[in-house]
Amino acid sequence: RRDVAHGILNEAYRKVLDQLSAGKHLQSLVARGVGGSLGGGAGDDAEPLSKRHSDGIFTDSYSRYRKQMAVKKYLAAVLGKRYKQRVKNKGRR
């Protein structure tokens, strides 16, 4: 039973670490300018990004990521592997 408890705790801890590393990954993408910056201009390198600015880019990268995930789900449902399962469910309605 103690092993099970440890397993559950480890799983929860791993999920937290995964979320943190995903956040770090997004931040590293932002730091490298992947996906384009929001406030792009000729004098971009004149001064470091303000926190609010970097938060804005982080949010933009995250929203792009969420959008891509939503599109992937849509494609799977209407053109891909989830379509057949949905057809079966439609038949049950």
Epitope: V71, A76, V78, G80
Partner: antibody, heavy 108, light 109 residues
């Protein structure tokens, strides 16, 4: 079933909303897509609305269209129509059940 | 943006014969999420094949989809008069959604 309505002759720049009415379809379980077809031309995907009501658009369609829904209808608003928007507009559940389409003509 | 290029129209087929239509994508189709549709004049498109090779419900096994990555083919064997129409491929792209090919008209003689 799926059926589109609202198509008509409009002048350029006059916003127009098309409505897709569904029956026997739970819109909280299915994606709804909009596709258009200019006279004598091919199919063009506009975008879709998610089960939770979030809308996503083709790159070319962003800002030109708005998709929204209620429990039994899905709307497509053409924000500022141009003559290039003259087409038959189709609504589809997923992409396997399509309505007959509604014709929009944009002309001055 | 991704571009899907189909076999130029029209393509002729004899009743009982075989016809193939190609669909080439300018970039790789996400997870081979490619579909084929049939459309007849004055009607909405009909869903035939999904995920490149899987038959949609109620579609005769005479229709066969194949291919992967950027190159896909729809083959209709034992062609019937009712198969006349325009066929469209549609590819899924994770960054931009769905793109349709330009369509290929099949004429049955």
């Amino acid at each position: 079933s799926v059926e589109e309505s609202g198509g008509r002759l409009v002048t350029p720049g006059t916003p127009l909303t098309l409505t897709c009415t569904v029956s026997g379809i739970d819109l909280s379980s299915y994606y709804m897509s909009w596709v258009r077809q200019a006279p004598g031309k091919g199919l063009e995907w506009i975008g879709f609305i998610d089960t939770d009501g979030s809308a996503y658009y083709a790159t070319w369609a962003k800002g030109r269209f708005t998709i929204s829904k209620t429990s039994t209808t899905v709307d497509l608003k053409i924000t500022s129509p141009t003559t290039e928007d003259t087409a038959t507009y189709f609504c589809a559940r997923d992409l396997d059940l399509w309505g007959p389409g509604t014709l929009v003509t944009v002309s001055s | 943006a991704a571009v899907l290029t189909q076999t130029p129209s029209p393509v002729s087929a004899a009743v009982g014969g075989t016809v193939s239509i190609s669909c080439q994508s300018s970039e790789s189709v996400y997870s081979n999420y490619l579909a084929w549709f049939q459309q007849k004049p004055g009607q909405p498109p009909k869903f035939l094949i999904y995920e490149a090779s899987k038959l949609a419900s109620g579609v005769p096994s005479r229709f066969k989809g194949s291919g992967s990555g950027t190159q896909f083919t729809l083959t209709i064997s034992d062609v019937q008069c009712d198969d006349a129409g325009t066929y469209y491929c549609a590819g899924g792209y994770s960054s931009e959604g769905v793109a349709f090919g330009g369509g290929t008209e099949v004429v049955v003689k």
